[in-house]
């Protein structure tokens, strides 16, 4: 069967070759071919070309529509991983490392501390903070994680907040806080995560992360 198929393919290929060769000869005006024969072959060839071009145009249209749709509403998403910092600042530091996401330049990680968006819209913003603390070693105040927003020309403000009391486990007990919500962001708005004691934050793989997704 396979051999018969091969012979069939070769025969078709040969016919195509003869057809193309005939068109060539028609174009060079070889005497051995009748004018009628040439006209027939030419119109046949034009028909093929027309079909190919129409097909190509349709595909092009579909693709350009897809592109327009994509351009108007591109996926905007980011997921960054916590980074231990020597700075004493209460704002957590993040990095594009490990299994991170940065969809395109419509969202950027600035100064390793804030995610900044270029497009206005509704965003789901989330953060997970894992910390290890001990009641005796810590102050009376609970461990608080805050998700904050900084809009151009305005003060930062708290969007979400969660608090956990310190563990009695020794040397310290691991606990996780998850924050997440949907917020309207303006172009140039930045979001960041603030904690009461950054030295207690766990930076092991998967423990502490931060991200957003445009809806």
């Amino acid at each position: 069967h396979r051999r018969l198929d091969k012979i069939e393919d070769e025969r078709n290929l040969h016919e195509d070759f003869v057809f193309m060769k005939t068109i060539q000869r028609c174009n060079t005006g070889e005497r051995s071919l009748s004018l009628l024969n040439c006209e027939e072959i030419k119109s046949q060839f034009e028909g093929f070309v027309k079909d190919i071009m129409l097909n190509k145009e349709e595909t092009k249209k579909e693709n350009s529509f897809e592109m327009q749709k994509g351009d108007q509403n591109p996926q905007i998403a980011a997921h960054v991983i916590s980074e231990a910092s020597s700075k004493t600042t209460s704002v957590l530091q993040w990095a594009e490392k490990g299994y991170y996401t940065m969809s395109n330049n419509l969202v950027t990680l600035e100064n390793g501390k804030q995610l900044t968006v270029k497009r206005q819209g509704l965003y789901y913003i989330y953060a997970q903070v894992t910390f290890c603390s001990n009641r005796e070693a810590s102050s009376q105040a609970p461990f608080i994680a805050s998700l904050c927003l900084k809009s151009p020309g305005r003060f930062e403000r708290i969007l979400l907040r969660a608090a956990n009391t310190h563990s009695s486990a020794k040397p310290c007990g691991q606990q996780s806080i998850h924050l997440g919500g949907v917020f309207e962001l303006q172009p140039g708005a930045s979001v960041f995560v603030n904690v009461t004691d950054p030295s207690q934050v766990s930076h092991g793989t998967g423990f502490t992360s931060f991200g957003l997704l445009k809806l």
């Epitope: 600042t89 020309g153 305005r154 603030n194």
Partner: nanobody, 120 residues
Framework: EVQLLESGGGLVQPGGSLRLSCAAS????????MSWVRQAPGKGLEWVST????????YYADSVKGRFTISRDNSKNTLYLQMNSLRAEDTAVYYC?????????????WGQGTLVTVSS
């Protein structure tokens, strides 16, 4: 009712230090930016420093940059101004001011002020 009560002023020698405090009540302290503004004898008001609601961002007048440090303790509803390397020209009444919501430059409430005198 919003109340801002400054304390910590006094007489200090040039090069010395002072720490001013401002106890706030009557509003959700952690939601507002807070500022220090001063008025030297016979002069107009001069903005000194501002701190954002959760204390992440601070702003200073060029005349005090590197010498003064603004801070806040939201759990105690208190604003601070640590003043180091004081000069004679820092002599003034220092006012604690509450910034209008989401504005860095507008103040809607002021304290009574505390006098700082820098003199040898």
């Amino acid at each position: 009712e919003v109340q801002l009560l400054e304390s910590g002023g006094g007489l200090v020698q040039p090069g010395g230090s002072l720490r001013l405090s401002c106890a706030a009540s009557g509003f959700t302290f952690e939601e507002y930016g807070m500022s220090w503004v001063r008025q030297a004898p016979g002069k107009g008001l001069e903005w000194v420093s501002t701190i954002s609601p959760i204390g992440v961002t601070t702003y200073y007048a060029d005349s005090v940059k590197g010498r003064f440090t603004i801070s806040r303790d939201n759990s105690k509803n208190t604003l601070y101004l640590q003043m180091n390397s004081l000069r004679a020209e820092d002599t003034a009444v220092y006012y604690c001011a509450k910034n209008a919501y989401d504005r860095k430059s507008n103040f809607d409430y002021w304290g009574q002020g505390t006098l700082v005198t820098v003199s040898s």
